[in-house]
Interface confidence: medium
Amino acid sequence: KFSKQSWGLENEALIVRCPRQGKPSYTVDWYYSQTNKSIPTQERNRVFASGQLLKFLPAAVADSGIYTCIVRSPTFNRTGYANVTIYKKQSDCNVPDYLMYSTVSGSEKNSKIYCPTIDLYNWTAPLEWFKNCQALQGSRYRAHKSFLVIDNVMTEDAGDYTCKFIHNENGANYSVTATRSFTVKDEQGFSLFPVIGAPAQNEIKEVEIGKNANLTCSACFGKGTQFLAAVLWQLNGTKITDFGEPRIQQEEGQNQSFSNGLACLDMVLRIADVKEEDLLLQYDCLALNLHGLRRHTVRLSRKNPIDHHS
């Protein structure tokens, strides 16, 4: 459960996150499992640990192996394992299956392709995108933040999409590429006024100060893959990106699912290290589509420690 597969290409940057999570204040120690040798934290090393992250700058085939991370708090230790494999660069265009991230599917109405793992890196826009090794050109393709949008998706748009970006570490630049398959579904469907399944209107969510909290905004929009549908969070009526609190982040990418034949989207809001002032904010789950907008408001309250222990 607490082991994670990670892979990369030689001479590219690879950053791996410890599968065990902890507060930012907790220390994380990394070891090379085969030798139990500690991974250094000094950034002058090609491979070094930086809190929850293990950085290969750049990676080498010899780095392949299992790495152990131990999250240490005053009261407990948690152990996780990162199974890292570094591959030689292919001379031809084919991207082998073992280098592919999860397949995403889209349709004529929904065509975002997210660049895998990019949130681990210190990168700046724009992303470069390639399909079957060819650079994407034309007005139908738009690189937006960490995803690619394809307007008017057609069956011919199916294929392997590679994002390429530059990771910057202390002034040094390292290339990173990641590839995933994109499949196209052709379907007709109905569009309904959005129905928010969670959270309930005016819900009070109990949280513990100092712990992490997740809020999920989930809504259904009709039958079939939906065009012009979005779910998002706002804080005190402001978009998360404009609010400017780095501890509170919206997950990049909306997860699409189907419930009783209805197309649903969800967006997770992650609050790290909950603070007292977070209890004063209004959290709005917004669901929008071409018919309009629905809004459910959530507020946070302090969880009673006695309830927690019982």
Partner: antibody, heavy 118, light 112 residues
Framework: QVQLVQSGAEVKKPGSSVKVSCKAS????????IHWVRQAPGQGLEWMGG????????HYARKFQGRVTITADESTSTAYMELSSLRSEDTAVYYC???????????WGQGTTVTVSS | DIVMTQSPLSLPVTPGEPASISCRSS???????????LDWYLQKPGQSPQLLIY???TLQSGVPDRFSGSGSGTDFTLKISRVEAEDVGVYYC?????????FGQGTKLEIK
Amino acid sequence: QVQLVQSGAEVKKPGSSVKVSCKASGYTFSDFSIHWVRQAPGQGLEWMGGMLPISHIAHYARKFQGRVTITADESTSTAYMELSSLRSEDTAVYYCARGGSSGWFEVWGQGTTVTVSS
Amino acid sequence: DIVMTQSPLSLPVTPGEPASISCRSSQSLLHSNGYNYLDWYLQKPGQSPQLLIYAASTLQSGVPDRFSGSGSGTDFTLKISRVEAEDVGVYYCMQGAHWPPTFGQGTKLEIK
């Protein structure tokens, strides 16, 4: 009240492009979809495409694929429709319309006449 | 794409008399939630279209109650109980059940 005000009439040469604007007022711009519908002289209504300003995704009718681009500027509550490689048959009145909880096209702009002539 | 067929294409009516316009779709517009995704729009001479009826039978706010819509599945009707001079224009049905939205060819209502 809810209003959509479009830019003025345009006369264009074949092969050129036209960009029509649609400024919204009286509601929260990013909360509703914006669509573009055209009407050639003496003809019916034809949906060209639409977008939800907050989602960054636009979608177009196949007929206009590759020629039309719909964008939106949330800071000015303005939607734009750009049609390229104009030909004489693109001569029409172009309407922007707001989606809504009632009909698909709840509120309409006053229309922009685009004439394509050499 | 869904094809919407209206009839008649021209409708001369005497003021005070009723009028009826038919609209047929090539596929069902009825959703399992009971809604028919069909709108009716009126375009008066020299004006932009305006929404009259949505979901086949629901009158848009501000529209006179002499207008009514009915039908389900593939067959729909717009009725005007007593036509007034201000009702002249072209009436369009439009389906929003299947992507992309498509309009009927229009019915021109004129006063006799």
